[in-house]
Amino acid sequence: MSNVPHKSSLPEGIRPGTVLRIRGLVPPNASRFHVNLLCGEEQGSDAALHFNPRLDTSEVVFNSKEQGSWGREERGPGVPFQRGQPFEVLIIASDDGFKAVVGDAQYHHFRHRLPLARVRLVEVGGDVQLDSVRIF
């Protein structure tokens, strides 16, 4: 879509209690999109969180990437996204992990694999029409 990829720098990083709010629309022909919490602004930076709704395979994948290698994939229960429908995702940082809230309910808890303090960039991309990204 025209408004992605979206990148928001986090020069101060994030800490436990930080809430990231992503609002957007899943286009009617969407295949998949992603939200990455990256440890740097350069290409190939480590990813503390890779949140990847996949409409094409009906799954939502969570992962991390360190030194160019992806970790073990985790999957959330079901797919709380629909083509052609708006969505709101909250990613809540805590001491022990990232809590993803989609719509009305907690969706998945992804335990930290990389130090939270390393996160420096939020990136949203793929098949998504982005409305807003806010950090609280």
Partner: nanobody, 128 residues
């Protein structure tokens, strides 16, 4: 600037009903969640109910009002309503509407929320 105009408060006997309204104007952005909070004399402001812009999302209710209060909204009028039935003395408070940046349930600890804008209050008094 966003303005939130609440109305509909008043005096009612226990068991009675009231309907509060809150109209948003100004630079409210598309898709905002709106909610109601209340503050009784000498107490902290507390969450009552909230509703998403999107009809696919379920409303949120505090346990103390569940089954008695119903929140609804008219997006074409940028207005949110709170229908309050079976009112009790403990519902007496000043009721505030708000634009809610985010809200989520956190198990036994209830709801966490962040408020973008507060409206001014409307007084509800339940007494015989």
């Amino acid at each position: 600037e966003v303005q939130l105009q609440a109305s509909g408060g008043g005096f009612v006997q226990p068991g009675g009903s009231l309907r509060l309204s809150c109209a948003a104007s100004g630079s409210t952005s598309y898709g905002e969640t709106m909610g109601w909070f209340r503050q009784a004399p000498g107490k902290e402001r507390e969450f009552v109910s909230a509703i998403s812009y999107y009809s696919t999302r379920k409303p949120y209710y505090a346990d103390s009002v569940k089954g008695r209060f119903t929140i609804s909204r008219d997006n074409s009028k940028n207005t949110v309503y709170l229908q309050m039935n079976s009112l009790r003395a403990e519902d007496t408070a000043t009721y505030y509407c708000a634009i809610v940046a985010y809200i989520y349930a956190d198990g036994v600890r209830g709801y966490h929320q962040k408020i973008d804008y507060w409206g001014q209050g409307t007084q509800v008094t339940v007494s015989s």
